[in-house]
């Protein structure tokens, strides 16, 4: 479970077609 103080930070993961991009790479979203 994520710590409460972390909740407003973006979480970054590897994914494909994410973050408005066509290729695979890191994507950080709140």
């Amino acid at each position: 479970r994520r710590r409460r103080r972390d909740t407003h930070f973006p979480i970054c993961i590897f994914c494909c077609g994410c973050c408005h991009r066509s290729k695979c790479g890191m994507c950080c979203k709140t």
């Epitope: 994520r2 972390d6 290729k23 695979c24 950080c28």
Partner: antibody
């Protein structure tokens, strides 16, 4: 100016521990993901670990998982690498590197000067 | 997974140097390139396949498709002599670097 300065390297015996530090200046440290990358003498680059914005959002290379711990103290603008159960193959220059700004931080845009870690009996 | 680079590339001053990086489905990932001069730390020269960070000369360019990413240095200068490393993400826990290519400017 933007700067990363590593410290804490040295000679250590196999099985022992060492903690590296990376002091950041010239940018808003808390707004960037931070990496550790190492380079064995005369060899190529090897990614070690990354810590993103949240303390819980961190990843490790298989070669160090369970032995190394990456952490950050945003109040001190400092990145850390706690290295336990060190092996001879961990001998390398250890660089801290800043992840690119933005929602898609694929590259390492700022690098420190590196600190040498030698694991030897 | 692994990224494969030629160990060395030689070029005459003013000519074009081409450094390749090969890996499984590399063209489906974003490739970055780093320059490392002897005794110095790496410097980012290309990211997201084709983009140049501010301060990097226009003679550096990149491409990436299929299984191969390419770094091209046009009008190569003596100061470009260095090791060059490609890099790409294959998962959240697998960031790969190529073995490096030593560029010699003859």
């Amino acid at each position: 100016q933007v700067q990363l300065v590593e410290s804490g390297g040295g000679v250590v015996q196999p099985g022992r521990s060492l903690r590296l530090s990376c002091a950041a200046s010239g940018f808003t440290f808390s707004s960037y993901g931070m990496h550790w990358v190492r380079q064995a003498p005369g060899k190529g680059l090897e990614w070690v670990a990354v810590i993103w914005y949240a303390e819980s959002n961190k990843y490790y290379a298989d070669s160090v998982k369970g032995r190394f711990t990456i952490s950050r103290d945003n109040s001190k603008n400092t990145l850390y690498l706690q290295m336990n159960s060190l092996r001879a193959e961990d001998t390398a220059v250890y660089y801290c590197a800043r992840a690119q700004e933005g929602i898609a931080p694929d590259a390492f845009d700022i690098w420190g000067q590196g600190t040498m870690v030698t694991v030897s009996s | 997974y692994e990224l494969t680079q030629p160990p060395s590339v030689s070029v005459s001053p003013g000519q074009t140097a081409t450094i390749t990086c090969s890996g499984d489905k590399l063209g489906e990932r974003y490739a970055s390139w780093y320059q490392q001069r002897p005794g110095q730390s790496p410097v980012l020269v290309i990211y997201q396949d084709i983009k140049r960070p501010s301060g990097i000369p226009e003679r550096f360019s990149g491409s990436n498709s299929g299984n191969t990413a390419t770094l091209t240095i046009s009008g190569t200068q003596a100061m470009d002599e260095a090791d060059y490393f490609c890099q790409a993400w294959y998962s959240s826990t697998n960031v790969l670097f190529g073995g490096g290519t030593k560029l010699t400017v003859l």
